[in-house]
């Protein structure tokens, strides 16, 4: 499956929108930084077959979509930017789902690398737990926004590597 160029552009647009969503100066939030232990090895496209890499990407985008679709998220961010961001993620999910279906028939290995998917889910659980512990404070959301920008950047790099493999 060739991920369309629009998918990559969508990812960049999502990153730009996320960058614009900040409501308070991050400079006041340095002490709120937290180690969410991003599973960087899951974004290393070299160790996966294509179907597995796409599954990881899909899980990453799905979890990001879920995180920003909560009531707490709606209260934290400017509504029109949040809606545009969610729309970009939704479009990416559609692209990836089409690819997942296509790749199942191509590769004989199991579609989902369960360990990798689990690692991504646990990563988002840590993010959610952090927000709960910090009572969804503005700084907590700023830290999470920065972290998601970082993980989306990893996703973008993984997509680039996938395209180079084609």
């Amino acid at each position: 499956c060739d991920l369309p160029q629009t998918h990559s552009l969508g990812n960049r647009r999502a990153l730009i929108l996320l960058g614009q969503m900040g409501r308070i100066s991050p400079f006041s939030c340095l002490k709120d930084r937290h180690d969410f232990r991003i599973p960087q090895e899951e974004f290393d496209g070299n160790q996966f077959q294509k179907a597995q890499a796409i599954s990881v990407l899909h899980e990453m985008i799905q979890q990001t979509f879920n995180l920003f679709s909560t009531e707490d998220s709606s209260a934290a961010w400017e509504q029109s930017l949040l809606e545009k961001f969610s729309t970009e993620l939704y479009q990416q999910l559609n692209d990836l789902e089409a690819c997942v279906i296509q790749e199942v028939g191509v590769e004989e290995t199991p579609l989902m690398n369960e360990d990798s998917i689990l690692a991504v889910r646990k990563y988002f659980q840590r993010i959610t737990l952090y927000l709960i512990e910090r009572k969804y404070s503005p700084c907590a959301w700023e830290v999470v926004r920065a972290e998601i920008m970082r993980s989306l950047s990893f996703s973008t790099n993984l997509q680039k590597r996938l395209r180079r493999k084609d």
């Epitope: 991050p26 400079f27 006041s28 939030c29 340095l30 002490k31 930084r33 926004r145 920008m149």
Partner: antibody, heavy 121, light 107 residues
Framework: EVQLVQSGAEVKKPGESLKISCKGS????????IGWVRQMPGKGLEWMGI????????RYSPSFQGQVTISADKSISTAYLQWSSLKASDTAMYYC??????????????WGQGTLVTVSS | DIQMTQSPSSLSASVGDRVTITCRAS??????LNWYQQKPGKAPKLLIY???SLQSGVPSRFSGSGSGTDFTLTISSLQPEDFATYYC?????????FGQGTKVEIK
């Protein structure tokens, strides 16, 4: 390869203006903040201020507030430090360094080579 | 502002010695502390971040410890290239602040 390349040494007279630069390459310039640090001859490191190039949000150390201006042009991945009226006491080496912002990553992991500013009549 | 106080301000040591430099913050900074090495005419180089994390490419003889207000940089076996000035820096709250530096000289 990540690099921060600063503009060359400057010799100025008191009262003159100056703008020095720091160009980032090898990474996403808007994903990191840029900090400026002063080192007067034979002295220690002093943090001057920091800028988020993505939106030019800037903060200064109280010691440098009103004395210098920090700016950035993200289209050319460059941050700036400027003075409108230099004093002899501004003679120092000035360093830029990148900061990961709110990400859990090393602070000031890459530094420019430094710009030596000499102010003398 | 958070004040950072390093001790000693200078020390003399021999190659192979174990060297310890301390840094004290005027208030708790959790583990938001970095250590830098600077050689004459060169830019500072990050050694340790978040109090105890070794920066990529830095030899394992360097280690950091501490949390809250008291921190330590240890060089387990001093090498000739380690003679330099070392600075701590807090990144807990703006304004960011550095210690005054510790110069490690050859005995």
């Amino acid at each position: 390869e990540v690099q921060l390349v600063q503009s060359g040494a400057e010799v100025k007279k008191p009262g003159e203006s100056l703008k020095i630069s720091c160009k980032g390459s090898g990474y996403s310039f808007t994903s990191y903040w840029i900090g400026w640090v002063r080192q007067m001859p034979g002295k220690g490191l002093e943090w001057m201020g920091i800028i988020d190039p993505s939106d030019s949000d800037t903060r200064y150390s109280p010691s440098f507030q009103g004395q210098v201006t920090i700016s950035a042009d993200k289209s050319i991945s460059t941050a700036y430090l400027q003075w409108s009226s230099l004093k002899a006491s501004d003679t120092a080496m000035y360093y830029c360094a990148r900061h990961p912002g709110l990400a859990w990553a090393p602070d000031f992991d890459y530094w420019g080579q430094g710009t030596l500013v000499t102010v003398s009549s | 502002d958070i004040q950072m106080t390093q001790s000693p301000s200078s020390l003399s040591a021999s190659v192979g010695d174990r060297v310890t430099i301390t840094c004290r913050a005027s208030q708790s900074i959790d583990d938001f502390l970095n250590w830098y090495q600077q050689k004459p005419g060169k830019a500072p180089k990050l050694l340790i971040y978040f109090a105890s994390s070794l920066q990529s490419g830095v030899p394992s003889r360097f280690s950091g410890s501490g949390s809250g207000t008291d921190f330590t940089l240890t060089i387990s076996s001093l090498q000739p290239e380690d003679f330099a000035t070392y600075y701590c820096q807090q990144s807990h709250t703006l304004p960011l602040t550095f210690g005054q530096g510790t110069k490690v000289e050859i005995k």
